[in-house]
Each structure stands twice: as C-alpha cells, then as structure tokens.
Amino acid sequence: EICGPGIDIRNDYQQLKRLENCTVIEGYLHILLISKAEDYRSYRFPKLTVITEYLLLFRVAGLESLGDLFPNLTVIRGWKLFYNYALVIFEMTNLKDIGLYNLRNITRGAIRIEKNADLCYLSTVDWSLILDAVSNNYIVGNKPPKECGDLCPGTMEEKPMCEKTTINNEYNYRCWTTNRCQKMCPSTCGKRACTENNECCHPECLGSCSAPDNDTACVACRHYYYAGVCVPACPPNTYRFEGWRCVDRDFCANILSAESSDSEGFVIHDGECMQECPSGFIRNGSQSMYCIPCEGPCPKVCEEEKKTKTIDSVTSAQMLQGCTIFKGNLLINIRRGNNIASELENFMGLIEVVTGYVKIRHSHALVSLSFLKNLRLILGEEQLEGNYSFYVLDNQNLQQLWDWDHRNLTIKAGKMYFAFNPKLCVSEIYRMEEVTGTKGRQSKGDINTRNNGERASCESDVLHFTSTTTSKNRIIITWHRYRPPDYRDLISFTVYYKEAPFKNVTEYDGQDACGSNSWNMVDVDLPPNKDVEPGILLHGLKPWTQYAVYVKAVTLTMVENDHIRGAKSEILYIRTNASVPSIPLDVLSASNSSSQLIVKWNPPSLPNGNLSYYIVRWQRQPQDGYLYRHNYCSKDKIPIRKYADGTIDIEEVTENPKTEVCGGEKGPCCACPKTEAEKQAEKEEAEYRKVFENFLHNSIFVPRPE
C-alpha cells in the first residue's frame, strides 16, 4: 500500500499504527515529540521499504533503535528534503544505534545526525555506500566514539562477519549494530544492487531485489515504477509523479487539496504530474490541466479585501511578492527603513497594473519610485476625492518618479496631484504628464510649482567627461570644469561609481533616503588652479569589470523662482583592463592506462578577462620506494598507509595540554591559539547549527488544531 502524502506521527506513539500497511511512504515521515518513554518492541513495520521524500526523527523518548521499527527500509529517495537532508536524527535522547540494516540508498540529499547523547555505531557505517556524496553529511554532538566501543558482529569471537571498507584512511569492519553487518554488493555488480545472496539485480532496481536481473523483482526502482515494473522512463500517456512512479491523466486530475480549489488541481507539464505549473509557465485557461509559457512575468492577481493596501514597511510589501495585477488601491507611506528601495523592488517590482489609485504620502525614505519597475497601467477604477488616481504628497526626499526614457506608464482615468515634494523637480512632473497621457486633466492647483522642487537643483547643466584611462584595477577620469554664473558657488564634485555588468543602470538604483545606496561615492575638491580640469583616480577595482560612473557638481547657486541650479554628467560605462586569472579549481588527475593521465579541472573563480587557453605542465616523479616494501603475493594483511589529515582531536588536546614539544626545547607548552580562520569557521559552524535548529522548530511546532 502506498501511504501519503507525508505522515506526521507526534505526541502519541500509538499513531505508529498508521504505518501498518505501508510499503511506500509517498512523501515524508516525521516521528517526533513523543515525550513519554514507551516500549516500542511490539511495533514493527516490515512492509515499509521506501520513503520518497525524507525521514525525520526528533525527541522520541524510549526509542533505542530504528531497526526493529523499519527492518526493511531500503531506500530514502529525497525527492523533497528537510533543509537539504534526507535523513535527520535530532535530539533522540535514548537512541543507541540507527540500526537501519537494510538501508542501501539515499538517492538525494545528505544526512544530519546531531545531539543524540546515547547514539553509537556511527563510525561503523560507511555512508559512501548509501549516498553519492558524503561531504555534506553533518554528524555532530552524539556519543563520543571512545565511549561507545562499537563492535561489529563476530569481532569479539575473532570471527568477524562483516566486510571492511576505508573511511578517512581507516580500514575497518562496517556494521549497523552489534549483530547486523552493513550489506555490500560484489564489485562485479558495479553500481547495481544485489540480492541477499549477492546476485546482481536488474539495472533498473535500486537498493535490493528478490530475484536477480528481473525488473519486476526490485524492492525499489532506480528511475520509475509502472504497473509492477521498474522502467527507465514513463510509457506514453503516463506521467512522472513524485519522482518515483508513473500515473495516468485521471490519477493526476483526481489528486485533491484542502488548500486549493478543484480548478487549481495538479497539472501535467513536461511529462510530469505536478502541483502547479513551474516558474515561467501558467495554466492554459482556468479549467486546464496543462501549462503554457508566460509572455513576460507570469500573471498573478492579488486583491486587497479592504480595497486599499497600505505599504508602510517591508513586511506589508512582502504580501505583494510576485503580484503582477493588483486589484485595489495602493497607499505608500514609507517613513523609514533599511535598504528600503531594493526591498520594495524585490516585493513590488513585478506589479504591472493597479486597478484603483496610487497614493504616495509622507514617504520620507523614498528617493525614487523606480522600485515599481514594471508598473505600466493605473486604471483609476476607484479614485480619491477630487478624482485623483495618482497622488503624491509630502515626500521630503523624493527626487525621481521613474526613468521616463525607459518607461511607459498610462493612467487610464483620473487626475494627478503633487504637493510638498521639495526635491522633486516640476519638470519631472510635467514629463510624467506627457508620458501617462494625463496632460490637460490637471487643474492649476494640482501641480504646485512653489513647493515641489524648492530644494532641488532642477535646472541642470551637463558635465562632460574629457578623458578616461584604465588599468587592471584603476580608472582615471577627468571632466570639464563646471562654471556656474557665480564661480564661488561651486563647492565640489561627487563621483558616483558601481559595478554594472549591463548598460541599464539609473542614478536612483537601490537608493533611499535612509543611507542605502548601491553607488559608491567619492568627493572631489576643486583643483586650486582654475585652468586644471577636475578628475579622480578610482582604485581597488576588479579587473575586466564594467563600471558605471557619473559626476555631480555640488553648488549653491540660486536661479529664478528660488530654484537651485546644478550640473551632472551622463552615466559613463567603462571597463577595467584584463589581468592574470586566479588558479584553476579542483584539479584532478587519474591514469586510464600505463601511458596516459587524464587531468580535469574547473575554470578559475576569477577569470579577470576572456580565457583563451590553459597551460598544463607535468614532470616525472621518482617511484615511491614504499611500494616495494611489501610482498603483495603473500596472504598477510596489506598495510594501510596512514596520511596525516591535519586535524586536531580537540578532546585529546584538552585532556593533556602540557605534553607538546614547542620549538626546539622540550618542556610544558600550551596548545597553539586558534587562528582567525579557525575562529571564523567555528563561528560559522555555530551559526549554521542555530539556523538549522530554528528551521526545525519552525517547521514542526504547529498550533493544535481547534
């Protein structure tokens, strides 16, 4: 029987009975928060062979081994993971061994075994036989191996029954418990599974099988299961489901969900039956089971129950993430915040249509409205009193509405209103009238020419660059000396620069009035000599990187209507020179014959230019005499070479800290202090542990159902 879609057993151990007839758990299995120590010996689920997602065990009192519960669990597929893990054993107070002696394969994901004070038999399991990569496994804070004294079957009687493998240069017996070896298949099977009698299974089997070379006798399938057979791909008119089986269209259409409407049921896309269309695709109509590509961002209609959505923080903006059509009105009131412009763009940047009005007031943290980077239509179906559909009032730092050279915005109905925006030039507002098609709708008092732009340099002259010079990490630029009507009112220049892979940046990108700015800023004083052109050397730049640069004059000059006159340049794009690349990564070499070496590597992390070729050098090394010291034809044990792995056993160091030899003199000496890198690594490790623990708690602690 297939059980699912995910089983959560908590609080009452008798809930385990739900697993009675399960052969496959399609989804996850949680066993957790059973605080009363129980006798689990009467609970045994020999039918369970596969979990398609992950297995999580957390705080189950009295459970000493998983072997009796799940004697035949063979495969954990890891189709969906718990924080990158397919097997999590966390804070299991009484667990003495894992004991899953039939576990042969964890298809995807790593394992996390942490804070299990009594747990042994961890160093005796060779996880590399079960997982593809063991580097992401996290096995920490369990019973120290020295206190375990793990013995594999037969070791005491000097008749060892288990096979040996090498882990971390230690060649040892591999077992799950004191009486269960870790199963290994003959090398002749290669990557194939094998039966209990060591006969190789069919290539489509995974984990084990009941008969050799038979695709109907598999315990689990390497790829997909269909009608009793393991198949490499789903047959025609069937679809992949949950990463392990093939189902027909009716099956897919009859998957129900308490969260979604029946018109939002599972879909068929790219040969798979899935919960919803993948990113970039949308249902082909409201009553469709199929997906079609979206033109541009996929439409997502969001509606505000109260008609008007107030955006006064990042949290309130978060509710609009992914929305492309907003049914209702937007009231933006951002007085303060950290990194607000980019946060708002992240959550509101996909909105294309607002059906009601947009009102921006008291938003002193905003410098620009460019965070609404896809807004193209304000319908004005609902308007503010006075028939306004775009209303901008008292925004002390607002300098730019949008970049009108790259923006089409239509206001279908209603007027615009602007007042008390001291840094917003009236010319910017007039430009918006032109673009949005509202010119002629506004009456005289709707755009106040006195209190909009009163503290801005609205009459801007253009500064022209005169020269640019680049090296691998420097740019030197000069520009024409700006001469305002009264030269004494020119205070200085400010140079703004940032990395710009594409030529599409604007002055207000990522900028807000609370100090966040994606541009680096450098102040440049006026050259004392009036004939020398101002300039700057920008250093500490990255090689072969395109930068955007612009310059602003800082002035005091007033012109008519008490408006400030200023000057700034266009944005200049300039690339630094190429440099020597960093070293190639992950160099591996292997011999595939007596006269050949295969060498592989990954590109450098910093190419610092366009890589055109690699240089490979090699030289012959003298043969290692070590290889001749042993008679490999004798039946003696082959020596295992011990390599220093560069790690310190912390426990040993703390036990006897005064036995090291320091320098050339013998004498008592303390352990070397930790390097900064080691300290940083420890800090990151502790942080990572906290993050995981928070994730675990947030995922599993839920309010009781009412």
Partner: antibody, heavy 118, light 107 residues
Framework: EVQLVQSGGGLVKPGGSLRLSCAAS????????MHWVRQAPGKGLEWISV???????YYADSVKGRFTISRDNAKNSLYLQMNSLRAEDTAVYYC????????????WGQGTTVTVSS | EIVLTQSPGTLSVSPGERATLSCRAS??????LHWYQQKPGQAPRLLIK???QSLSGIPDRFSGSGSGTDFTLTISRLEPEDFAVYYC?????????FGQGTKVEIK
C-alpha cells in the same frame, strides 16, 4: 459497464461500529478520487468523506474522528469504517465517483441503509 | 466550510412552464458548482457540471449559468418526469457541500 456495488449496511446500536464496502468495476479504480455521501430519512444530501488517488483523506466535521475512509486498489474497493455511531448517523449511504474538470463522469452506488437505534 | 443556500425551498410549476432554481454560495467558488436531480428511492443524477456544462444523455431543456457566488438552474419546459428534488453541490473547496434542495412540484 462502469458501476459501484455497495454492501455492509444494517442495524447497529449507538456507540457501535459498522464497515461499509463499495466494489468498483468498469474503470481504473486507482485513478479516481472516491467519495461517501449520505442522506438521512426525509432530508437532503450530505457529503461526508473523500479519499484521493494518493490516499489523502478528508472528512466533514460531523464525522471527523469517528469515521475512516480507506481504499484497496488491488481489490478495486472503497471502505467506510464507522465507529461511535449515533442516532443522527442513520441514513442511506452512497459511494460516489465524482469526475473533475477534465473527465466528469458521475457514478453512484445503489445506496446502503444504516440504522443506528437501541 | 462553504454554505450553499438554495431558493425557493419548494417551487410549484405547471408542466410546460419554465422553472428557475437558484443556488447561492457563502464565498466565491468560481464555476465549481454542479446540479443533481433526485427522485424518491433513487440515487442522485448529475444534470449540469461546472455551472453551465451540459452532459450527454441529459435533455437540453436543462441549462445552468452563473459563477462566483450566484448560480441558476433553468428548466425551459417542464416535463412530467422533471418533478423531483434538485440539489446544488460545490467541489471547489474541501469539505464539499450540498445545498438543502429545492422541491419542484406540480402546480
């Protein structure tokens, strides 16, 4: 021919248990969600439970915690285990295969009577 | 849960006349509403699926309309065999629910 044949109804005392069965034929049983609907004497239809193709189960509040829906795809059978029965559970019980947007062929069992009385 | 309210409770109509039955949902259910006819001692019979989609074998005098919260079943000319109880049923959200029924009787 697509059909659903029900069995297992009868008279039971309050607090007692009963198991209803519904045998399906003429279609791929495992590919359809299956429902139970009941009708008390002289009253309207009341939806009580569904089991989908994955085995996920959902219940009406009136039976939650007392009734259990299950299926055996190998036997093409649907079940309703009814425990802690009450007088108000007296009704004709129907098993029902509801279609969906893409394939809506509605099939009902013949109905089976459950009487809860002391 | 979504509550379906049918009106009127009883509808008295003469054969050959038009009958209009209403079903209102307590919240929007899109078009996931179905109409059933039930005669005494029989299982229900589906007439209209998804608000307005007709089914083969059902006479075309039965038609459905509506979406969101308001739905209507119309029987254009009542035949003697049409006198029965009619139920609406929503499958939009779990738990599914039925309306309390409208009895169509001979005037």
């Amino acid at each position: 021919e697509v059909q659903l044949v029900q069995s297992g109804g009868g008279l039971v005392k309050p607090g007692g248990s009963l198991r209803l069965s519904c045998a399906a034929s003429g279609f791929t049983f495992s590919s359809f969600a299956m429902h139970w609907v009941r009708q008390a004497p002289g009253k309207g239809l009341e939806w009580i439970s569904v089991i989908d193709t994955r085995g996920a189960t959902y219940y009406a509040d009136s039976v939650k915690g007392r009734f259990t829906i299950s299926r055996d795809n190998a036997k093409n059978s649907l079940y309703l285990q009814m425990n802690s029965l009450r007088a108000e559970d007296t009704a004709v019980y129907y098993c029902h295969r509801l279609g969906n947007f893409y394939y809506h062929m509605d099939v009902w069992g013949q109905g089976t009577t459950v009487t809860v009385s002391s | 849960e979504i509550v379906l309210t049918q009106s009127p409770g009883t509808l008295s109509v003469s054969p050959g006349e038009r009958a209009t039955l209403s079903c209102r949902a307590s919240q929007s259910i899109g078009s996931s509403l179905h109409w059933y006819q039930q005669k005494p001692g029989q299982a229900p019979r589906l007439l209209i699926k998804y608000a307005s989609q007709s089914l083969s074998g059902i006479p075309d005098r039965f038609s459905g309309s509506g979406s969101g919260t308001d739905f209507t079943l119309t029987i254009s000319r009542l035949e003697p065999e049409d006198f029965a109880v009619y139920y609406c049923h929503q499958s939009s959200r779990l738990p599914h629910t039925f309306g309390q029924g409208t009895k169509v009787e001979i005037k």
